[in-house]
Each structure stands twice: as structure tokens, then as C-alpha cells.
């Protein structure tokens, strides 16, 4: 008995060939011996089965001895053994129809779980193997679960259902709703304008929701809201902004915030949360601000940084075109009685300069 696997909603062709390449009488029946379709004279006739409105045959191939039955818009309950009667012989074809669907919306927030459920005919024992766009392989039976979706899980998932050495492939498009980056750090000299950008890792025709930037300044004892906003069809409108600092927000996507001046009291880390309409949960992006200040006071030249810096970062004071350098894995360095000239304060990570500030030391007579 031949086994054919089909996909729910698809079309399948069950073949039946006569030994002689000529038009002859044939019938397709189900396992209950109910006629589905056949030939009477030169005409296709249909029986009383539930399939009658979805079953057809290729008339153009009859004179080649090919009497296939085509079933459109397959349903799980179409799974059955079908019998083709032609030239006094019977050919049996077992059709197994499977469906694979996501249990929820296919637009899911990062960190949420994805469950794929296999619909299968009674008595079947299929196995399912899914491959994510990032190459992750997951296996399961009737259900496949991905507990925590990541950005890289966005795209087309390819799932293969296997039964009796036969396979059928499903493709499911999953959109993981997330920001492009989980975290970003902006390095600025004191007084410079700061630009924060929060690009999304997905595109939606209509994007509506609301959000907030919640900030923990390094020097502050508690965190606070810097700005709240609404998003209507990709248009941004500010709801409430703190008095200090007075942030500005772009009216279009990507979400874009401008801090007029980088000041030590603003250095710290923030969390931008975005809630999307009809979704429970929020998208998050962490943003850090590191601020550098170089000052000369009396005989002391000091360079300081504020904000979240890793312990492996190096802070240096260096006299331009001279070898004089003081370096520390600390948040402040200083030189007593510095030589006159242009001094550079550098914040670097393994030799790569992240931030630099120049200060001119004038000779004292």
C-alpha cells in the first residue's frame, strides 16, 4: 500500500495508472467503499462522499491511462485509505494529512515562548523536526516548544514531519518583536549633545503602542522616568518629559532621543520599554551613557569619567607629542604640576579609543 503525506489546506494528487494507455472506466472510493469520483462514458461523475466538492481528476491524462484523483483544501479528516478501481484491479493509497500551526500569534515578543502544534490523523505516530532561521534544531512529537525566543529566531522556520519513511515540509514565518540591540553605550565629553537611537528589529505595517525611558543616574539614589511617549501608526508623540534633563524625541521611527548636553549627573544607565498594541509584555533596550570631563584646577590636571564602565577600561592622561602618560584602570586619573601643552584624556578598551577629550595646560610663570 502506497503512503502519501499531505498538508492541511494544500492540494494532493493520488495517482492511479492503468496498464494500457487509453481511456477506460475507473472509480475512486474511500475505505467505507463510498464512491468519490469516477468515469461514466466520457464524463466525470461524483459520488455521495464528503469529498465530492473538493475532489477532481485530470481529464487530459485519461487517454494516457492516468486516472489520478486531486483533493483540494486538504483537511485532517481526509486522512484515509483510498481505493482506485481500474481494469479489474484495485490500487490502495493511504493518505495522511498533517497540519502544523503556531499556538498563538506568530508575532511574538523577545523572551516569549513559541509553541508549534501538530495536527495529525488518529493512529499516526509522526515525528517533527524544526530548524530555526539561525540554524537551531528542535525535535518533538505533537508539540514543539521554544521556551525563550531570541532576535535571531525571526524569519522562516522549516519543519519536517516524518511518518512511515515519508516526509512533508512546513514553513512558518515567525516575527520576533525586539529592538535591534539588547544594549548600547554612548560615550560623550561633558557638554556634548547626546543622541540615543532605538531601532527595531522588525517592521509592521501599523505600529501602535507606548513607551518610557526609565533612568538610573550613577550619582542618584533612585531611578526615575525621563520621558514617556505614545506611538500611533509609527508617529511618536511625547506624553511627559522630566524637567531635568529636558529630552527631545523624534516624531518618526526609529525611536530617537536627544539629550542637549552630556553632564556628569546624567551619566548612568536607562531602560527603554515599549509596549505594543494587542501584545502583553514589553520590548526592552538598555542604554548607557558615559561622560568624560577633563579639568585643570591650580596645579592639578584631572580626567574623570562617570557612568557604567567596565573594570578593564583604561583611563589615560597623555601629553601630546611627548611620552608623558599616566594610565589607570579607574574612573579618575590626575597629574600634579602638569607640563604645559595639549593634554589628551583617553578612555580605551584594549587599545581602542572610546572617548577622548583635550585640555590645554598653559605655562604658569
Amino acid at each position: 500500500k502506497k503512503v502519501v503525506l499531505g498538508k492541511k489546506g494544500d492540494t494532493v494528487e493520488l495517482t492511479c495508472n492503468a496498464s494500457q494507455k487509453k481511456n477506460t472506466q475507473f472509480h475512486w472510493k474511500n475505505s467505507n467503499q463510498i464512491k468519490i469520483l469516477g468515469i461514466q462514458g466520457l464524463f466525470l461523475t461524483k459520488g455521495p462522499s464528503k469529498l465530492s466538492d473538493r475532489a477532481d481528476s485530470r481529464k487530459s491524462l485519461w487517454d494516457q491511462g492516468c486516472f489520478s484523483m486531486i483533493i483540494k483544501n486538504l483537511k485532517i479528516e481526509d486522512s484515509d485509505t483510498y481505493i482506485c478501481e481500474v481494469e479489474n484491479k484495485k490500487e490502495e493509497v493511504e493518505l495522511l494529512v498533517f497540519g502544523l500551526t503556531a499556538n498563538s500569534d506568530t508575532h511574538l515578543l523577545e523572551g516569549q515562548s513559541l509553541t508549534l502544534t501538530l495536527e495529525s490523523p488518529p493512529g499516526s505516530s509522526p515525528s517533527v523536526k524544526c530548524r530555526s532561521p539561525g540554524g537551531k534544531n528542535i525535535q518533538g512529537g505533537r508539540t514543539i516548544s521554544v521556551p525563550q525566543l531570541e532576535r535571531q529566531d525571526s524569519g522562516t522556520w522549516t519543519c519536517t514531519v516524518s511518518q512511515d519513511q515519508k516526509t512533508v515540509e512546513f514553513k512558518i514565518d515567525i516575527v520576533v518583536l525586539a529592538f535591534q540591540k539588547a544594549s548600547s553605550t554612548v560615550y560623550k565629553k561633558e557638554g556634548e549633545q547626546v543622541e540615543f537611537s532605538f531601532p527595531l528589529a522588525f517592521t509592521l505595517e501599523k505600529l501602535t503602542g507606548s513607551g518610557e525611558l526609565w533612568w538610573q543616574a550613577e550619582r542618584a539614589s533612585s531611578s526615575k522616568s525621563w520621558i514617556t511617549f505614545d506611538l500611533k501608526n509609527k508617529e511618536v508623540s511625547v506624553k511627559r518629559v522630566t524637567q531635568d534633563p529636558k529630552l527631545q524625541m523624534g516624531k518618526k521611527l526609529p525611536l530617537h532621543l536627544t539629550l542637549p548636553q552630556a553632564l556628569p549627573q546624567y551619566a548612568g544607565s536607562g531602560n527603554l520599554t515599549l509596549a505594543l498594541e494587542a501584545k502583553t509584555g514589553k520590548l526592552h533596550q538598555e542604554v548607557n551613557l558615559v561622560v568624560m570631563r577633563a579639568t585643570q584646577f591650580q596645579e592639578n590636571l584631572t580626567c574623570e569619567v562617570w557612568g557604567p564602565t567596565s573594570p578593564k577600561l583604561t583611563l589615560s592622561l597623555k601629553l601630546e607629542n611627548k611620552g608623558a602618560t599616566v594610565s589607570k584602570q579607574a574612573k579618575a586619573v590626575w597629574v600634579l604640576n602638569p607640563e604645559a601643552g595639549m593634554w589628551q584624556c583617553l578612555l580605551s578598551d584594549s587599545g581602542q579609543v572610546l572617548l577622548e577629550s583635550n585640555i590645554k595646560v598653559v605655562p604658569t610663570w
Epitope: 507606548s210 518610557e212 542618584a220 526615575k224 522616568s225 522630566t242 524637567q243 531635568d244
Partner: antibody, heavy 119, light 107 residues
């Protein structure tokens, strides 16, 4: 520790006036919007008014507009509610609340002060 | 003004029960919704902000969901200290408005 403490409640005749005060501590008062919320005996919560950090914006529920005035003194870490032309339906426990929670939530509430308007 | 309608107005449950309270806004409020718990003679306490985020220090048995006009507060396993009145509140537009409250009582 964040604390908000209300005072000034009491018994007042209809048509009379009362001034409620709220003393805040444990946070930078001048950085937060503040609200007054009331609760009539055995009833639910009703937001009354709020005021921006530096006092430039004030909002009221319709039922108190023109009768109540919210104000603040950031130097004294204090919030006030001046209530004039009081009515029996203004009888309630009045809470001073910090609007400092994420997503504009009301995160710290005082213990409340009872205002009774009765002849 | 935006009307907030809570249901049911009261619910009886036993320790360990799952309790769900719904809140409906008369117009869309995105995720500008908070849930509060109030015990007799005490000030309200913030539980959930932004429709679904848990306030620091609040037990994880409390959860919030929804956006737009329909919101839900769920207590997954009722504890003795959870018997109280719960209020939803919108912060989408002035005046801020509260639901009428849902009293969770012992069965």
C-alpha cells in the same frame, strides 16, 4: 526611605475652607509630579488633582475645578491642597501621592487625612 | 473622561485559588494602566504598572495583561494576605480615573 505625610484634615461646615499639607522626604521632591487622591467612606478611589515638578502645570477632576487649588513649595518639600466652598460630597480621606512609578503609576501613598464636611 | 469598569465587583475564593479581575476602559489607553491593592484602613499599594509589569517587591503570583481597552489582573494562587480590594487606574489622559474596585473575599 520615601515618605509622604498628610496633615490638615478635620471637620468643616459646608461652604467652608480647609488647607491640606503633605510633607515629603526620602526623595528629590522637585523631580516628581505629585497628586491628591481621595476616598469617600466605604467608596472607591477618586483622583483629584496633580501638579508638575516645578508647578507650571496643574490638572483637576471636573467636580473640584474652581474650588480646589493644588500647589507646591519645592524648597520645603511640601504639597498643598487649598479646598474652598466645601460640600458634603467632598467628605473623604485625602491621600498625597507621588507620581514616580514607571509608566506614570502612583507609587508612594501617604496614610491619608480625613476631611469631614458637615453642619 | 475615560470610564474604567471593573468586574466582578466582588469575588470569593479560597487559599490556592486562581482569581481573575478584569478592567475595561471606555476608550483605548494603550498600556497606561496600573493595578493597586488596598486593605481596610490602609493606603493603596501599587502592584502592576504599564498593564503587565510587576512592581518591585510584589509577589510573582500577581500578573497583569492586556492593552487597548481590555485588561486583566490575575492572582495565580490566592494567599491569606491577598484578601483585599483591587483597583485599576488609567494614566492615558487627564483626569486619571480608577475602576470602582473589586473586593476579593474569603469563601
Amino acid at each position: 526611605e520615601v515618605q509622604v505625610v498628610e496633615s490638615g484634615g478635620g471637620l468643616v461646615q459646608p461652604g467652608g475652607s480647609l488647607r491640606l499639607s503633605c510633607a515629603a522626604s526620602g526623595f528629590t521632591f522637585s523631580s516628581y509630579w505629585m497628586s491628591w487622591v481621595r476616598q469617600a467612606p466605604g467608596k472607591g478611589l477618586e483622583w483629584v488633582a496633580n501638579i508638575k515638578e516645578e508647578g507650571s502645570e496643574k490638572y483637576y477632576v471636573d467636580s473640584v475645578k474652581g474650588r480646589f487649588t493644588i500647589s507646591r513649595d519645592n524648597a520645603k518639600n511640601s504639597l498643598y491642597l487649598q479646598m474652598n466652598s466645601l460640600r458634603a460630597e467632598d467628605t473623604a480621606v485625602y491621600y498625597c501621592v507621588r507620581e514616580g512609578g514607571q509608566w506614570l503609576a502612583l507609587d508612594y501613598w501617604g496614610q491619608g487625612t480625613l476631611v469631614t464636611v458637615s453642619s | 473622561d475615560i470610564q474604567m469598569t471593573q468586574s466582578p465587583s466582588s469575588v470569593s475564593g479560597s487559599v490556592g485559588d486562581r482569581v481573575t479581575i478584569t478592567c475595561r476602559a471606555s476608550q483605548g489607553i494603550s498600556s497606561w494602566l496600573a493595578w493597586y491593592q488596598q486593605k481596610p484602613g490602609k493606603a493603596p499599594k501599587l502592584l502592576i504598572f504599564g498593564a503587565s509589569s510587576l512592581q518591585s517587591g510584589v509577589p510573582s503570583r500577581f500578573s497583569g495583561s492586556g492593552s487597548g481597552t481590555d485588561f486583566t489582573l490575575t492572582i495565580s494562587s490566592l494567599q491569606p494576605e491577598d484578601f483585599a480590594t483591587y483597583y485599576c487606574q488609567q494614566a492615558n489622559s487627564f483626569p486619571w480615573t480608577f475602576g470602582q474596585g473589586t473586593k476579593v473575599q474569603i469563601k
